[in-house]
Amino acid sequence: EAHKSEIAHRYNDLGEQHFKGLVLIAFSQYLQKCSYDEHAKLVQEVTDFAKTCVADESAANCDKSLHTLFGDKLCAIPNLRENYGELADCCTKQEPERNECFLQHKDDNPSLPPFERPEAEAMCTSFKENPTTFMGHYLHEVARRHPYFYAPELLYYAEQYNEILTQCCAEADKESCLTPKLDGVKEKALVSSVRQRMKCSSMQKFGERAFKAWAVARLSQTFPNADFAEITKLATDLTKVNKECCHGDLLECADDRAELAKYMCENQATISSKLQTCCDKPLLKKAHCLSEVEHDTMPADLPAIAADFVEDQEVCKNYAEAKDVFLGTFLYEYSRRHPDYSVSLLLRLAKKYEATLEKCCAEANPPACYGTVLAEFQPLVEEPKNLVKTNCDLYEKLGEYGFQNAILVRYTQKAPQVSTPTLVEAARNLGRVGTKCCTLPEDQRLPCVEDYLSAILNRVCLLHEKTPVSEHVTKCCSGSLVERRPCFSALTVDETYVPKEFKAETFTFHSDICTLPEKEKQIKKQTALAELVKHKPKATAEQLKTVMDDFAQFLDTCCKAADKDTCFSTEGPNLVTRCKDALA
């Protein structure tokens, strides 16, 4: 229904705490360089205004759209042009163009320092002094670095953060209580960020239909006992929620997500037998829980898929009658039978089925043409299964760090023009798939591996879009989202690449490396590895292993030496010489 004042409506629905959190996230995602204090001031002004509208919906400006209200706030910031350059031009536009302009200026890779966690004592002190400000800082810092982070989910992670601090700051050994728990939240939040970015990419590049297809497949896997009408309703609602969040309409998004969670909990009987535990939780936990609820048990008596989609005489008539509905039912029926497939694979199969019907239904004898379609799915299914087996075997053999290095070599050979920091970030993220997925039961590996890889590769594409340097990457990123991962997997050594000349300084290290945390040490070594491959793209695995082992030995020796500086300055040049010889 229409409300006289949209801002009053959302404030009432969400409550002050969530309202303020969401407005802070929205501002931080739009203007990523502003300080927390600048944004906190704007949030307070917006909240005070919302309260006046709650008191009197007819008050001045209360009838304005949220985009107008928020956009006016952002555009009133002093020194906008000095700090944000051409983003200030957005303020010359009218809504809805102004909001579109803000969205286009979101930066997926802002030049902000990494979000450093303070040490435990300091963290607990500032948390105890002012928990609200502390959590505000968390929302601001995450949101500005991840401008498409799913806002209601970020509120959930902030709540987790809050609970961990409340518990651990009361402990004697705060550090050992906080570190593993906060690391866990950070890891989950980073995965959530790349997954949501993928959803927004799908929406932005291919529209709502593409996202809805993703949602139908995913929901059908999770709720195989729900009928097609129920799945369609959930997919439509989920598409609306994601469209709003991706579009910067965070208050509407969070409100609609809460509504969807409420609907699911009120209709468990027609959706799934696994929802009760989630539905007993408070709002943020409930919605999070529902988003990753375990798959319901598949109905035992499902007929073979061929009956309705190959053997039925009416296939082409049903397809002609309502293409999207017929393809939707195919995707639903196939997905509910295959919780062991990735959503990407299911969408590729649906696309293959659609292409087959397009071709065959135009022929004089369609059944003879589409009769073999299910057999033609086989290679499409085998390819990701082989990928999972090969990569999980390699991960089990090498461990996470070694597996990341193997991926780094592979991807540097595929796209040596890409900047080394981007290659290292991508390889480290891709390499985490082993730890994340390869330890799962067999039937959960494929969906875990492929859907995670697809999300990471989406980030590679977004970063590459900013500064396109590799034709290989451009080719894979230009196609449909579901074809990206197979495209990247199929890439081989880029034969057009002219190797980088060997620069000794790239491989010169100093004693400061010894005091770096293990993660930073790994990044330094991986940076050197990528540079080696750029110098010798056709180096064998054996040659690279020899050099990297030598390098590790050199670091180990010099970091244990009494006079580290002397060791680095004398042994370093010898290492460089040996590297050159080994790769000659």
Epitope: Q313, E314, V315, C316, K317, Y319, A320, E321, E358, C361, A362, E363, A364, N365, P366, P367, A368
Partner: nanobody, 115 residues
């Protein structure tokens, strides 16, 4: 909504000709192969002829090959069946269908061949 409306049936003497039409709506006609099927009194449905979406490929049942010609006009969303040298055994209700369907979902048009 897909709609198929057949017309052109009637009573003819053996050896004569008839031309059946099928007006299609509610779908992209040119993207779909079309067929004619028939049902003789007290019998099941029998496939007669099919044509590809572009009209270049045609198929016929042995019982009508050489006598019947299937064609289409995509600009008019219409399917045709030219029936020459009609025989008593061609008496049936004729239906047009989408793709290779052997299921009638329209009214059909009755062809009676009798002297």
């Amino acid at each position: 909504k897909v709609q198929l409306v057949e017309s052109g049936g009637g009573l003819v003497q053996p050896g004569n000709s008839l031309r059946l039409s099928c007006a299609a709506s509610g779908f992209t006609f040119s993207s779909f192969g079309m067929s004619w099927v028939r049902q003789a009194p007290g019998k099941g449905l029998e496939w007669v002829s099919s044509i590809s979406g572009g009209g270049s490929d045609t198929l016929y049942a042995d019982s009508v090959r050489g006598r019947f010609t299937i064609s289409r006009d995509n600009s008019k969303n219409t399917l045709y069946l030219q029936m020459n040298s009609l025989r008593a055994e061609d008496t049936a209700v004729y239906y047009c269908t989408i793709g290779g369907s052997l299921r009638a979902s329209s009214q059909g048009t009755l062809v009676t061949v009798s002297s």
